[in-house]
């Protein structure tokens, strides 16, 4: 159910492309293709190529992305394209000018002097943005989201985008300065991961991050469980970055117990994050237990 044919507008296409990219990434990282048959990988890659090609139709002259060519470009959508394409670079041929042009646009057009990334044209499909939806800590959450995307594109775009390291530092400064005032577990988790990637989740910030976990195993706010899965996935990635292998097992157990296999309405971010986090766990954790995750690989009929 994770391998789907991407289609529709610039937002729907990314909704459709997400599960296929993350499923292939997960199975690559955990070396599990034998279970499904290697020939299925090729079919999945064709779908990713299709999604990539279709997405280029929604690329604007500024290198940013929107649901439609004539619609104002979205900060969040452009950052998400950067994030997905950065992961897909190892799977299909992606034009670095497409990726790094989007990075440059985010930095030059959407980052304020204090490091914050602003959104002037929110996506139509609000269900695709996960825990950022109706988030009253929007500056922190969106800045963390964009910063994570920039860091994932760093190796690819550093040479083409001179302002990238400075932009990352500035966004990190903003997150660090405001982190201790956060109230939502979701924002603590996503900003925590952004800071951990920079080696800046330390001291009081680390204490805030660790003590925000409920029962030492999940980052949870009242409301949608999908957002808690997404938040806890960000937190797991942060813990892995910190090499805090004492804290990791109960978090992995909790994620596993949710029996969340992705797919369904509003699942874009939870799907992407849970598989990214669990793939990273199986790669990084010294003696990880095998995770029996149900990744179904039925290719869509042509």
């Amino acid at each position: 159910h994770l391998i789907v044919t991407p289609s529709g507008c610039g937002e729907q296409n990314m909704i459709g492309m997400t599960p296929t990219v993350i499923a292939v990434h997960y199975l690559d990282e955990t070396e599990q293709w034998e279970k499904f048959g290697l020939e299925k990988r090729q079919g999945a890659l064709e779908l990713i190529k299709k999604g990539y090609t279709q997405q280029l139709a929604f690329r604007q002259p500024s290198s940013a992305f929107a649901a439609f060519v004539k619609r104002a470009p979205s900060t969040w959508l452009t950052a998400y394209v950067v994030k997905v394409f950065s992961l897909a670079v190892n799977l299909i041929a992606i034009d670095s000018q497409v990726l790094c042009g989007a990075v440059k646009w985010l930095i030059l057009e959407k980052q304020k002097p204090d490091g914050v990334f602003q959104e002037d044209a929110p996506v139509i499909h609000q269900e695709m943005i996960g825990g950022l939806r109706n988030n009253n800590e929007k500056d922190m959450a969106l800045t963390a989201f964009v910063l994570i995307s920039l860091q994932e594109a760093k190796d690819i775009c550093e040479e083409q985008v001179n302002s990238l390291p400075g932009s990352i530092t500035k966004a990190g400064d903003f997150l660090e300065a405001n982190y201790m005032n956060l109230q939502r577990s979701y924002t603590v988790a996503i900003a925590g991961y952004a800071l951990a990637q920079m080696g800046r989740l330390k001291g009081p910030l680390l204490n805030k991050f660790l003590t925000t976990a409920k029962d030492k195993n999940r980052w949870e706010d009242p409301g949608k469980q999908l957002y808690n899965v997404e938040a806890t996935s960000y937190a797991l990635l942060a813990l892995l970055q910190l090499k805090d292998f004492d804290f990791v097992p109960p978090v992995v157990r909790w994620l596993n117990e949710q029996r969340y296999y992705g797919g369904g309405y509003g699942s874009t971010q939870a799907t992407f994050m849970v598989f990214q986090a669990l793939a990273q766990y199986q790669k990084d954790a010294p003696d990880h237990q095998e995770l029996n995750l149900d990744v179904s690989l039925q290719l869509p009929s042509r």
């Epitope: 577990s185 330390k202 001291g203 009081p204």
Partner: antibody, heavy 116, light 107 residues
Framework: QVQLQQSGAELVRPGTSVKVSCKAS????????IEWVKQRPGQGLEWIGV????????NYNEKFKGKATLTADKSSSTAYMHLSSLTSEDSAVYFC?????????WGQGTLVTVSA | DIQMTQSTSSLSASLGDRVTISCRAS??????LNWYQQRPDGTVKLLIY???RLHSGVPSRFSGSGSGTDYSLTISNLEQEDIATYFC?????????FGGGTTLEIR
């Protein structure tokens, strides 16, 4: 204004336990971490651990695991530190402090004396 | 654990003097250094966080500097109310650790 009011001095027997309280006022209690610090007579300061009153999440200095237990009661805006199996080494002044980027506001300290 | 060393345990100075108190970490603490003042009555106050940022209400005669492993607190114009013990604390790596303190006395 922000205030942390700690409970009064305690004289306790070795082997027993004690609970020190720290009542917060002047701010939203659930929104800030509360840290605990130990100061032995004429000595420096030692970090014991931290509690997040919003989630009851804790993090301890390894040295104080099993010795100190941190709790918080949101309804009364009070943080507590329970110290068990007391020995003369536990005789000290114990401080609570509100964490920001640094221990921004401190209680006045609670002297715990362990003596037979 | 990171060791914090304040090599001078006590310091004599006159009112109006410029006083510098130093603190050394056993490893790089990337600027996560705070300074506290403990008055003779036991009350503790945060003076400076992140090397040089003044906590609210702290007089501007206090300043902090340093990098890597070496840091210092300077009081530019010593006043009677500054007579206290000063502690440095690293906020870089858990567990937090403090220096042994430097006590200021009036000469």
């Amino acid at each position: 204004q922000v205030q942390l009011q700690q409970s009064g001095a305690e004289l306790v027997r070795p082997g027993t336990s004690v609970k020190v309280s720290c009542k917060a006022s002047g701010y939203a209690f659930a929104h800030y971490l509360i840290e605990w610090v130990k100061q032995r007579p004429g000595q420096g300061l030692e970090w014991i651990g931290v509690i997040n009153p919003g989630t009851d999440g804790t993090n301890y200095n390894e040295k104080f695991k099993g010795k100190a237990t941190l709790t918080a009661d949101k309804s009364s805006s009070t943080a507590y530190m329970h110290l068990s199996s007391l020995t003369s080494e536990d005789s000290a002044v114990y401080f609570c402090a509100r964490e920001e980027l640094g221990f921004a506001y401190w209680g006045q300290g609670t002297l715990v004396t362990v003596s037979a | 654990d990171i060791q914090m060393t304040q090599s001078t345990s006590s310091l004599s100075a006159s009112l109006g003097d410029r006083v510098t108190i130093s603190c050394r970490a056993s490893q790089d603490i990337s600027n996560h250094l705070n300074w506290y003042q403990q008055r003779p009555d036991g009350t503790v106050k945060l003076l400076i966080y992140y090397i040089s940022r003044l906590h609210s209400g702290v007089p501007s005669r206090f300043s902090g500097s340093g990098s890597g492993t070496d840091y210092s607190l300077t009081i530019s114009n010593l006043e009677q109310e500054d007579i206290a013990t000063y502690f440095c604390q690293q906020g870089d790596t858990l567990p937090y650790t403090f220096g042994g303190g430097t006590t200021l006395e009036i000469r």
